[in-house]
């Protein structure tokens, strides 16, 4: 039997059953999430669930830029340090950098400080690049 690899939307890349779209547009976290949803296919800001997934994404993004942080789908909606993925994925894999998570920083970004392999919390109103994800 021939198993066809699913195709992603133009400009998105495929990895292990998921499609990812990296957008070098400036959005606050909630606008970024709504834009991801607008692309259909059940897309959301990306959940990152393993080191392998993180490494693949980081390698891809590093081909475009190495200095701008990028919103991902991890947030703290109750503002109680109870982090959850916006797409409903289980929050098991963690890759926080050592930076403080205090103040009003209730949305997560991939940090450029460690080649996008670690996360930092940031203020959700900040305008930043963002990463979307869906399962084709």
């Amino acid at each position: 039997d021939i198993i066809m690899r699913p195709s992603c939307a133009p400009g998105w890349f495929y990895h292990k059953s998921n499609c990812y779209g990296y957008f070098r547009k400036l959005r606050n976290w909630s606008d970024a999430e709504l834009e991801c949803q607008s692309y259909g296919n059940g897309a959301h800001l990306a959940s990152i669930l393993s080191l392998k997934e993180a490494s693949t994404i980081a390698e891809y993004i590093s081909g475009y830029q190495r200095s701008q942080p990028i919103w991902i789908g991890l947030h703290d909606p109750q503002k109680r340090q109870q982090w959850q993925w916006i797409d409903g994925a289980m929050y098991l894999y963690r890759s926080w950098s050592g930076k403080s998570m205090g103040g009003n920083k209730h949305c997560a970004e991939m940090s450029s400080n460690n080649n996008f392999l670690t996360w930092s919390s940031n203020e959700c109103n900040k305008r930043q690049h963002f990463l979307c994800k869906y399962r084709p």
Partner: antibody, heavy 118, light 109 residues
Amino acid sequence: QVQLQESGPGLVKPSETLSLTCTVSGDSLSRSSYYWGWIRQPPGKGLEWIGSVFYSGSADYNPSLKSRASISVDTYQNQVSLKLTSVTAADTAVYYCARDDGSTFDPWGRGTLVTVSS
Amino acid sequence: YVLTQPPSASETPGQRVTISCSGSSANIEYNFVYWYQQLPGTAPKLLIYRNNQRPSGVPDRFSGSKSGTSASLAISGLRSEDEADYYCAAWDDSLNGYVFGTGTKVTVL
């Protein structure tokens, strides 16, 4: 209830630097996690975004004004400042400050008229 | 100005008036559109956010919509207090900044 009040000289000479201050009450700049923007409106004309500064100090500017505009925050005095260098008569306008949530402006200050004339 | 609006619009009380806002894929098509009302001699006030949402206190006579690179604001049941300038606005991805429309003066006849 957040309120914004612009202040500064109403008259500036050509080639000089326009300096305005926006005092924020009802919110703490250091804890609010917002951008704070400046928008201007020449008499009888439309609105033009000058730029916005995040409370931490990083700023975005209108490309057409980027070389002349500088926006900064003073979290101790709860103020946002605008400096516009090398002004001409075309910079005569009502200058507004507004809170910017990364998506839109709300609320706005009442505005202050700055006239550039010798 | 990157966003284009008609300079004026007028209608009699109780009628409906629609204001258009034309842009591009860099702003309106892939960004949210916002509308501001500026009553004579006052600062602008947010009227519509995220294309079609009304802040609390804004009557449901005001409605926003968007299709492709154009947006529109409709005012139904027009009243004399609606006489004002109306501006559309959006983030522009090519400029990395906000852009405003040229503004439309609404007159209630």
